[in-house]
Protein backbone atom coordinates (compact mmCIF):
# COMPACT_ATOMS: atom_id res chain seq x y z
CA UNK A 1 0.00 0.00 0.00
CA UNK A 2 1.47 3.33 -1.07
CA UNK A 3 0.56 6.52 0.80
CA UNK A 4 -1.41 4.66 3.43
CA UNK A 5 -0.85 4.03 7.10
CA UNK A 6 -0.75 1.17 9.53
CA UNK A 7 -4.18 -0.35 10.01
CA UNK A 8 -5.75 -0.71 13.43
CA UNK A 9 -4.89 -4.20 14.67
CA UNK A 10 -7.51 -6.83 13.79
CA UNK A 11 -10.05 -4.26 12.59
CA UNK A 12 -10.26 -6.11 9.27
CA UNK A 13 -10.84 -9.68 10.46
CA UNK A 14 -11.49 -10.88 6.92
CA UNK A 15 -7.94 -10.05 5.84
CA UNK A 16 -5.72 -12.93 4.73
CA UNK A 17 -2.08 -13.28 3.76
CA UNK A 18 -1.51 -15.84 1.02
CA UNK A 19 1.93 -17.26 1.68
CA UNK A 20 4.40 -19.44 -0.18
CA UNK A 21 7.04 -21.26 1.82
CA UNK A 22 6.22 -19.05 4.81
CA UNK A 23 6.61 -15.74 2.94
CA UNK A 24 3.82 -13.28 2.17
CA UNK A 25 3.00 -13.36 -1.52
CA UNK A 26 -0.46 -11.86 -1.93
CA UNK A 27 -3.44 -10.59 -0.05
CA UNK A 28 -6.68 -12.47 0.24
CA UNK A 29 -10.09 -12.15 1.81
CA UNK A 30 -12.03 -14.69 3.84
CA UNK A 31 -15.41 -15.04 2.16
CA UNK A 32 -16.62 -18.21 3.89
CA UNK A 33 -15.45 -20.31 6.82
CA UNK A 34 -13.29 -22.48 4.58
CA UNK A 35 -12.67 -20.24 1.57
CA UNK A 36 -10.35 -17.34 0.80
CA UNK A 37 -10.70 -15.25 -2.34
CA UNK A 38 -7.53 -13.91 -3.95
CA UNK A 39 -6.08 -13.19 -7.41
CA UNK A 40 -5.36 -15.93 -9.95
CA UNK A 41 -1.98 -14.52 -10.92
CA UNK A 42 -0.75 -15.02 -7.37
CA UNK A 43 -0.46 -18.75 -8.09
CA UNK A 44 1.87 -18.11 -11.00
CA UNK A 45 4.42 -16.70 -8.57
CA UNK A 46 3.99 -19.65 -6.24
CA UNK A 47 5.74 -22.09 -8.60
CA UNK A 48 5.94 -25.41 -6.76
CA UNK A 49 6.13 -23.86 -3.30
CA UNK A 50 3.82 -24.73 -0.42
CA UNK A 51 0.82 -22.39 -0.46
CA UNK A 52 -0.69 -21.51 2.91
CA UNK A 53 -3.10 -18.89 4.22
CA UNK A 54 -2.49 -16.79 7.32
CA UNK A 55 -5.60 -15.56 9.11
CA UNK A 56 -6.06 -13.39 12.21
CA UNK A 57 -2.83 -11.50 11.64
CA UNK A 58 -1.81 -7.90 12.03
CA UNK A 59 1.95 -8.38 12.18
CA UNK A 60 3.40 -11.00 9.85
CA UNK A 61 6.30 -11.71 12.22
CA UNK A 62 5.11 -11.11 15.77
CA UNK A 63 3.18 -13.69 17.79
CA UNK A 64 -0.52 -12.87 18.14
CA UNK A 65 -3.12 -15.08 19.82
CA UNK A 66 -5.51 -14.88 16.87
CA UNK A 67 -2.95 -15.79 14.18
CA UNK A 68 -3.17 -19.15 12.50
CA UNK A 69 -1.62 -20.56 9.35
CA UNK A 70 -3.85 -22.88 7.29
CA UNK A 71 -2.80 -25.34 4.64
CA UNK A 72 -4.62 -25.15 1.32
CA UNK A 73 -6.69 -28.17 0.34
CA UNK A 74 -7.59 -26.91 -3.11
CA UNK A 75 -6.74 -23.92 -5.29
CA UNK A 76 -9.40 -22.95 -7.83
CA UNK A 77 -8.39 -20.22 -10.28
CA UNK A 78 -11.17 -18.79 -12.45
CA UNK A 79 -11.31 -21.07 -15.51
CA UNK A 80 -10.91 -18.14 -17.90
CA UNK A 81 -7.93 -16.52 -16.19
CA UNK A 82 -4.80 -16.32 -18.34
CA UNK A 83 -1.16 -15.44 -17.57
CA UNK A 84 -1.06 -12.68 -20.21
CA UNK A 85 -4.18 -10.77 -19.13
CA UNK A 86 -5.78 -9.42 -15.98
CA UNK A 87 -9.23 -10.59 -17.07
CA UNK A 88 -10.99 -12.91 -14.59
CA UNK A 89 -8.12 -12.52 -12.13
CA UNK A 90 -9.76 -14.45 -9.30
CA UNK A 91 -8.67 -17.43 -7.24
CA UNK A 92 -10.52 -19.35 -4.57
CA UNK A 93 -8.46 -21.19 -1.97
CA UNK A 94 -10.10 -23.90 0.09
CA UNK A 95 -8.54 -24.17 3.52
CA UNK A 96 -7.63 -27.59 4.89
CA UNK A 97 -10.30 -27.07 7.56
CA UNK A 98 -12.89 -24.49 8.54
CA UNK A 99 -11.26 -21.41 10.02
CA UNK A 100 -11.72 -20.88 13.73
CA UNK A 101 -13.83 -17.75 13.78
CA UNK A 102 -13.48 -15.04 16.40
CA UNK A 103 -13.14 -11.28 16.67
CA UNK A 104 -9.98 -11.31 14.53
CA UNK A 105 -11.16 -13.90 11.99
CA UNK A 106 -14.48 -13.36 10.23
CA UNK A 107 -15.73 -13.71 6.66
CA UNK A 108 -16.59 -10.53 4.78
CA UNK A 109 -19.96 -10.27 3.00
CA UNK A 110 -19.40 -9.83 -0.73
CA UNK A 111 -21.40 -7.87 -3.24
CA UNK A 112 -23.88 -9.95 -5.23
CA UNK A 113 -25.76 -7.12 -6.96
CA UNK A 114 -24.02 -6.57 -10.29
CA UNK A 115 -24.06 -2.79 -10.30
CA UNK A 116 -21.13 -0.37 -10.49
CA UNK A 117 -20.04 1.37 -7.31
CA UNK A 118 -20.78 5.09 -7.56
CA UNK A 119 -17.68 7.00 -8.75
CA UNK A 120 -16.21 9.04 -5.93
CA UNK A 121 -17.20 6.50 -3.29
CA UNK A 122 -14.39 6.11 -0.78
CA UNK A 123 -13.36 2.49 -0.37
CA UNK A 124 -10.85 0.78 1.87
CA UNK A 125 -8.01 -1.33 0.54
CA UNK A 126 -5.55 -3.09 2.83
CA UNK A 127 -2.52 -5.29 2.48
CA UNK A 128 1.03 -6.20 3.33
CA UNK A 129 2.28 -5.09 -0.09
CA UNK A 130 5.20 -2.72 -0.62
CA UNK A 131 4.97 0.74 0.96
CA UNK A 132 7.58 2.52 -1.14
CA UNK A 133 8.84 2.54 -4.70
CA UNK A 134 12.08 1.15 -3.29
CA UNK A 135 10.13 -1.99 -2.46
CA UNK A 136 10.06 -1.77 1.33
CA UNK A 137 7.72 -4.41 2.73
CA UNK A 138 5.78 -3.73 5.93
CA UNK A 139 5.48 -6.19 8.78
CA UNK A 140 2.11 -4.82 9.90
CA UNK A 141 -1.04 -4.48 7.84
CA UNK A 142 -1.45 -1.17 6.00
CA UNK A 143 -4.57 0.44 4.61
CA UNK A 144 -5.60 3.36 2.46
CA UNK A 145 -8.88 5.01 1.50
CA UNK A 146 -9.33 5.41 -2.25
CA UNK A 147 -12.07 7.05 -4.34
CA UNK A 148 -13.66 4.90 -7.03
CA UNK A 149 -12.94 6.18 -10.53
CA UNK A 150 -15.47 5.98 -13.31
CA UNK A 151 -14.73 3.41 -16.01
CA UNK A 152 -14.75 5.92 -18.86
CA UNK A 153 -11.95 7.95 -17.28
CA UNK A 154 -10.06 4.79 -16.41
CA UNK A 155 -10.30 3.65 -20.02
CA UNK A 156 -8.88 6.85 -21.50
CA UNK A 157 -5.97 6.41 -23.87
CA UNK A 158 -3.71 8.18 -21.37
CA UNK A 159 -4.85 5.81 -18.61
CA UNK A 160 -5.67 2.15 -19.30
CA UNK A 161 -6.62 2.63 -22.94
CA UNK A 162 -9.78 0.53 -23.10
CA UNK A 163 -8.47 -2.43 -21.08
CA UNK A 164 -11.02 -2.03 -18.27
CA UNK A 165 -13.98 -4.30 -18.86
CA UNK A 166 -17.42 -4.23 -17.22
CA UNK A 167 -16.11 -6.89 -14.86
CA UNK A 168 -13.45 -4.57 -13.46
CA UNK A 169 -13.46 -1.32 -11.53
CA UNK A 170 -10.87 1.35 -10.93
CA UNK A 171 -9.77 3.47 -7.99
CA UNK A 172 -7.66 6.61 -8.03
CA UNK A 173 -3.92 6.14 -7.69
CA UNK A 174 -2.54 9.61 -7.04
CA UNK A 175 0.30 8.72 -4.64
CA UNK A 176 -2.14 6.57 -2.66
CA UNK A 177 -2.53 3.15 -4.20
CA UNK A 178 -2.42 -0.60 -3.84
CA UNK A 179 0.85 -2.10 -5.06
CA UNK A 180 2.99 -5.24 -5.41
CA UNK A 181 2.07 -7.70 -2.69
CA UNK A 182 -1.43 -6.26 -2.25
CA UNK A 183 -2.79 -8.31 -5.17
CA UNK A 184 -5.69 -10.52 -4.15
CA UNK A 185 -6.61 -8.23 -1.29
CA UNK A 186 -10.03 -6.67 -0.68
CA UNK A 187 -11.49 -3.37 -1.80
CA UNK A 188 -14.27 -2.74 0.72
CA UNK A 189 -17.04 -0.21 0.21
CA UNK A 190 -19.97 0.20 2.60
CA UNK A 191 -18.95 -2.83 4.62
CA UNK A 192 -19.08 -5.12 1.60
CA UNK A 193 -16.38 -6.67 -0.58
CA UNK A 194 -16.68 -4.96 -3.97
CA UNK A 195 -13.33 -5.62 -5.58
CA UNK A 196 -10.19 -7.72 -5.47
CA UNK A 197 -6.83 -6.13 -6.25
CA UNK A 198 -5.63 -7.41 -9.64
CA UNK A 199 -2.13 -8.78 -9.91
CA UNK A 200 -0.73 -7.16 -13.01
CA UNK A 201 2.72 -5.53 -12.93
CA UNK A 202 1.15 -2.06 -13.06
CA UNK A 203 3.08 1.01 -11.96
CA UNK A 204 1.82 2.13 -8.53
CA UNK A 205 1.00 5.60 -7.25
CA UNK A 206 0.79 7.20 -10.71
CA UNK A 207 -2.52 9.00 -11.17
CA UNK A 208 -2.48 8.18 -14.89
CA UNK A 209 -2.49 4.46 -14.09
CA UNK A 210 -5.42 3.90 -11.73
CA UNK A 211 -5.64 0.80 -9.58
CA UNK A 212 -7.58 -2.03 -11.19
CA UNK A 213 -9.88 -4.27 -9.17
CA UNK A 214 -11.89 -7.32 -10.20
CA UNK A 215 -15.58 -6.75 -9.44
CA UNK A 216 -16.74 -9.70 -7.33
CA UNK A 217 -20.44 -9.13 -8.13
CA UNK A 218 -19.67 -9.93 -11.74
CA UNK A 219 -18.46 -13.38 -10.66
CA UNK A 220 -21.20 -14.25 -8.17
CA UNK A 221 -22.32 -17.34 -10.10
CA UNK A 222 -18.77 -18.70 -10.29
CA UNK A 223 -18.04 -18.01 -6.62
CA UNK A 224 -21.30 -19.67 -5.58
CA UNK A 225 -20.62 -22.70 -7.76
CA UNK A 226 -17.18 -23.25 -6.24
CA UNK A 227 -18.31 -22.69 -2.66
CA UNK A 228 -21.34 -24.95 -3.07
Amino acid sequence: ILGGREAEAHARPYMASVQVNGEHLCGGVLVAEQWVLSAAHCLEDAADGKVQVLLGAHSLSQPEPSKRLYDVLRAVPHPDSRPDTIDHDLLLLQLSEKATLGPAVRPLPWQRVDRDVEPGTLCDVAGWGIVSHAGRRPDRLQHVLLPVLDRATCNRRTHHDGAITQRMMCAESNRRDSCKGDSGGPLVCGGVLEGVVTSGSRVCGNRKKPGIYTRVASYAAWIDSVLA
Partner: antibody, heavy 117, light 112 residues
Protein backbone atom coordinates in the same frame (compact mmCIF):
# COMPACT_ATOMS: atom_id res chain seq x y z
CA UNK B 1 -6.50 15.67 21.46
CA UNK B 2 -8.98 12.89 20.79
CA UNK B 3 -12.57 13.83 21.57
CA UNK B 4 -15.82 11.92 21.13
CA UNK B 5 -18.92 14.09 21.40
CA UNK B 6 -22.22 12.21 21.75
CA UNK B 7 -25.74 13.42 21.03
CA UNK B 8 -28.26 14.45 23.67
CA UNK B 9 -30.47 12.18 25.75
CA UNK B 10 -33.42 10.49 24.05
CA UNK B 11 -36.87 9.69 25.38
CA UNK B 12 -38.68 7.11 23.26
CA UNK B 13 -41.82 4.99 23.29
CA UNK B 14 -41.72 1.18 23.38
CA UNK B 15 -41.49 -0.19 19.83
CA UNK B 16 -39.94 2.99 18.46
CA UNK B 17 -36.38 3.52 17.17
CA UNK B 18 -33.68 5.99 18.15
CA UNK B 19 -30.52 7.01 16.35
CA UNK B 20 -27.66 8.54 18.33
CA UNK B 21 -24.45 10.05 17.09
CA UNK B 22 -20.81 10.26 18.11
CA UNK B 23 -18.71 12.99 16.49
CA UNK B 24 -14.97 12.32 16.53
CA UNK B 25 -12.22 14.92 16.45
CA UNK B 26 -8.51 15.13 17.11
CA UNK B 27 -7.57 12.16 14.90
CA UNK B 28 -8.18 10.69 11.46
CA UNK B 29 -11.66 9.21 11.76
CA UNK B 30 -11.09 6.48 9.16
CA UNK B 31 -7.99 5.12 10.90
CA UNK B 32 -9.81 3.64 13.90
CA UNK B 33 -12.86 1.56 14.60
CA UNK B 34 -15.64 3.09 16.66
CA UNK B 35 -17.07 0.83 19.35
CA UNK B 36 -20.31 1.12 21.27
CA UNK B 37 -20.86 0.04 24.87
CA UNK B 38 -24.11 -0.24 26.84
CA UNK B 39 -24.54 0.51 30.55
CA UNK B 40 -27.86 -0.11 32.21
CA UNK B 41 -28.60 1.97 35.34
CA UNK B 42 -26.45 0.69 38.19
CA UNK B 43 -25.09 -2.10 36.01
CA UNK B 44 -21.84 -3.04 34.32
CA UNK B 45 -20.58 -2.49 30.78
CA UNK B 46 -21.58 -4.52 27.73
CA UNK B 47 -19.82 -4.36 24.37
CA UNK B 48 -22.32 -3.89 21.53
CA UNK B 49 -20.10 -3.87 18.46
CA UNK B 50 -17.98 -1.68 16.22
CA UNK B 51 -17.81 -0.10 12.82
CA UNK B 52 -14.67 0.42 10.80
CA UNK B 53 -15.44 3.79 9.19
CA UNK B 54 -12.85 3.27 6.45
CA UNK B 55 -14.61 0.46 4.62
CA UNK B 56 -17.83 0.38 6.64
CA UNK B 57 -17.21 -3.12 8.03
CA UNK B 58 -19.24 -3.89 11.16
CA UNK B 59 -19.02 -6.58 13.81
CA UNK B 60 -21.58 -7.09 16.56
CA UNK B 61 -21.99 -8.86 19.85
CA UNK B 62 -24.51 -11.56 18.84
CA UNK B 63 -26.83 -10.37 21.62
CA UNK B 64 -27.23 -6.99 19.91
CA UNK B 65 -27.13 -8.03 16.25
CA UNK B 66 -30.87 -7.65 15.63
CA UNK B 67 -31.26 -4.63 17.88
CA UNK B 68 -28.58 -2.28 16.56
CA UNK B 69 -27.33 -0.89 13.29
CA UNK B 70 -23.99 0.90 13.17
CA UNK B 71 -23.14 3.39 10.44
CA UNK B 72 -20.55 6.10 9.88
CA UNK B 73 -20.30 9.26 7.83
CA UNK B 74 -16.71 9.85 6.77
CA UNK B 75 -17.34 13.41 5.61
CA UNK B 76 -18.45 14.57 9.06
CA UNK B 77 -16.34 12.13 11.12
CA UNK B 78 -19.49 10.92 12.83
CA UNK B 79 -20.52 7.42 13.86
CA UNK B 80 -24.15 6.50 14.43
CA UNK B 81 -25.98 3.78 16.28
CA UNK B 82 -29.63 3.05 15.66
CA UNK B 83 -31.61 1.02 18.19
CA UNK B 84 -34.87 -0.47 16.97
CA UNK B 85 -37.98 -2.09 18.51
CA UNK B 86 -37.22 -0.44 21.82
CA UNK B 87 -38.23 -2.02 25.13
CA UNK B 88 -37.56 -1.05 28.74
CA UNK B 89 -34.47 -3.29 28.59
CA UNK B 90 -32.94 -0.79 26.17
CA UNK B 91 -33.09 2.02 28.73
CA UNK B 92 -29.41 2.67 29.35
CA UNK B 93 -26.47 4.97 28.79
CA UNK B 94 -24.73 4.20 25.51
CA UNK B 95 -21.08 5.12 25.07
CA UNK B 96 -19.02 5.34 21.92
CA UNK B 97 -15.38 4.48 22.52
CA UNK B 98 -12.15 4.34 20.56
CA UNK B 99 -9.35 1.91 21.14
CA UNK B 100 -5.68 2.57 21.44
CA UNK B 101 -4.11 -0.77 20.60
CA UNK B 102 -6.55 -3.22 22.20
CA UNK B 103 -8.07 -1.22 25.05
CA UNK B 104 -10.50 1.68 25.23
CA UNK B 105 -8.48 4.82 25.85
CA UNK B 106 -11.11 7.31 24.67
CA UNK B 107 -14.81 7.47 25.59
CA UNK B 108 -17.71 9.72 24.68
CA UNK B 109 -19.70 11.27 27.51
CA UNK B 110 -22.60 8.86 26.89
CA UNK B 111 -26.14 9.19 25.56
CA UNK B 112 -28.97 8.32 27.93
CA UNK B 113 -31.87 6.50 26.30
CA UNK B 114 -35.08 6.23 28.31
CA UNK B 115 -37.84 3.98 27.00
CA UNK B 116 -41.19 4.80 28.55
CA UNK B 117 -44.83 4.63 27.57
CA UNK C 1 -17.53 -15.73 25.51
CA UNK C 2 -15.05 -15.20 28.30
CA UNK C 3 -16.83 -14.42 31.56
CA UNK C 4 -15.22 -11.93 33.93
CA UNK C 5 -16.08 -12.20 37.64
CA UNK C 6 -15.23 -9.38 40.03
CA UNK C 7 -15.20 -9.47 43.80
CA UNK C 8 -16.25 -8.05 46.08
CA UNK C 9 -19.15 -6.25 44.42
CA UNK C 10 -18.69 -3.39 46.87
CA UNK C 11 -16.04 -2.37 49.34
CA UNK C 12 -16.28 0.16 52.19
CA UNK C 13 -12.94 1.79 52.93
CA UNK C 14 -11.39 4.62 54.86
CA UNK C 15 -9.17 7.27 53.31
CA UNK C 16 -5.53 6.17 53.50
CA UNK C 17 -6.40 2.49 53.57
CA UNK C 18 -4.88 -0.10 51.20
CA UNK C 19 -7.44 -1.77 48.99
CA UNK C 20 -7.36 -4.81 46.75
CA UNK C 21 -10.06 -6.03 44.42
CA UNK C 22 -10.18 -9.23 42.39
CA UNK C 23 -11.05 -10.13 38.82
CA UNK C 24 -11.20 -13.71 37.58
CA UNK C 25 -11.65 -14.82 33.98
CA UNK C 26 -13.33 -18.03 32.83
CA UNK C 27 -10.28 -18.82 30.68
CA UNK C 28 -6.66 -17.75 30.63
CA UNK C 29 -5.91 -14.28 29.30
CA UNK C 30 -2.19 -15.04 29.09
CA UNK C 31 -0.87 -15.54 25.56
CA UNK C 32 2.25 -17.69 25.68
CA UNK C 33 3.55 -16.23 22.42
CA UNK C 34 4.26 -12.84 23.97
CA UNK C 35 3.74 -13.54 27.68
CA UNK C 36 1.13 -10.79 27.87
CA UNK C 37 -2.16 -10.84 29.74
CA UNK C 38 -4.96 -9.31 27.68
CA UNK C 39 -6.64 -7.46 30.52
CA UNK C 40 -7.38 -3.81 31.35
CA UNK C 41 -8.84 -1.95 34.34
CA UNK C 42 -11.13 1.10 34.21
CA UNK C 43 -12.38 3.54 36.81
CA UNK C 44 -15.85 5.05 36.53
CA UNK C 45 -16.91 7.86 38.80
CA UNK C 46 -20.63 8.69 39.25
CA UNK C 47 -22.07 10.41 36.19
CA UNK C 48 -18.83 10.04 34.23
CA UNK C 49 -17.49 7.85 31.45
CA UNK C 50 -15.08 5.02 32.26
CA UNK C 51 -11.40 5.98 32.39
CA UNK C 52 -8.54 3.67 31.48
CA UNK C 53 -6.21 2.90 34.39
CA UNK C 54 -4.23 -0.22 33.50
CA UNK C 55 -3.62 -2.32 30.38
CA UNK C 56 -1.67 -5.54 29.75
CA UNK C 57 -2.80 -6.36 33.33
CA UNK C 58 -0.04 -4.28 34.93
CA UNK C 59 0.95 -1.33 32.71
CA UNK C 60 -0.25 1.96 34.16
CA UNK C 61 -1.83 4.39 31.72
CA UNK C 62 -0.01 7.71 31.38
CA UNK C 63 -1.18 10.16 34.04
CA UNK C 64 -2.58 7.51 36.37
CA UNK C 65 -1.20 7.89 39.93
CA UNK C 66 1.27 5.23 41.02
CA UNK C 67 -0.93 4.24 43.96
CA UNK C 68 -2.86 2.15 41.40
CA UNK C 69 -1.20 -1.19 40.64
CA UNK C 70 -2.42 -4.05 38.48
CA UNK C 71 -1.11 -7.57 39.00
CA UNK C 72 -1.90 -11.20 38.28
CA UNK C 73 -1.68 -13.57 35.36
CA UNK C 74 -3.69 -16.23 33.57
CA UNK C 75 -7.14 -16.17 35.12
CA UNK C 76 -6.59 -14.28 38.41
CA UNK C 77 -6.00 -10.55 38.51
CA UNK C 78 -5.88 -7.88 41.19
CA UNK C 79 -6.16 -4.11 41.26
CA UNK C 80 -4.52 -2.55 44.31
CA UNK C 81 -4.84 1.02 45.56
CA UNK C 82 -2.01 1.51 48.01
CA UNK C 83 -3.55 4.42 49.91
CA UNK C 84 -7.09 5.37 49.00
CA UNK C 85 -7.97 9.01 48.43
CA UNK C 86 -11.50 10.42 48.47
CA UNK C 87 -11.26 10.99 44.71
CA UNK C 88 -10.79 7.23 44.18
CA UNK C 89 -14.38 6.46 45.20
CA UNK C 90 -15.76 4.94 42.04
CA UNK C 91 -16.68 1.67 40.35
CA UNK C 92 -13.74 -0.33 38.96
CA UNK C 93 -14.18 -2.64 35.99
CA UNK C 94 -11.87 -5.25 34.55
CA UNK C 95 -12.03 -5.90 30.81
CA UNK C 96 -10.58 -8.71 28.74
CA UNK C 97 -9.56 -8.19 25.14
CA UNK C 98 -8.20 -11.66 24.45
CA UNK C 99 -11.38 -12.61 22.61
CA UNK C 100 -14.77 -10.92 22.14
CA UNK C 101 -14.68 -7.94 24.46
CA UNK C 102 -16.24 -8.51 27.86
CA UNK C 103 -16.23 -6.63 31.16
CA UNK C 104 -16.63 -7.63 34.77
CA UNK C 105 -19.69 -6.46 36.73
CA UNK C 106 -17.54 -4.00 38.67
CA UNK C 107 -16.39 -3.37 42.24
CA UNK C 108 -17.85 -0.30 43.91
CA UNK C 109 -15.48 1.52 46.24
CA UNK C 110 -17.40 3.41 48.96
CA UNK C 111 -16.47 5.42 52.01
CA UNK C 112 -16.84 3.69 55.38
Amino acid sequence: QVQLQQSAAELARPGASVKMSCKASGYTFTDYTMHWVKQRPGQGLEWIGYINPSGGYTDYNQKFKDKTALTADKSSSTAYMQLSSLTSEDSAVYYCARRRDYWFAYWGQGTLVTVSA
Amino acid sequence: DIVMSQSPSSLAVSVGEKVTMSCKSSQSLLYSGNQKNYLAWYQQKPGQSPKLLIYWASTRESGVPDRFTGSGSGTDFTLTISSVKAEDLAVYYCHQYYSYLTFGAGTKLELK
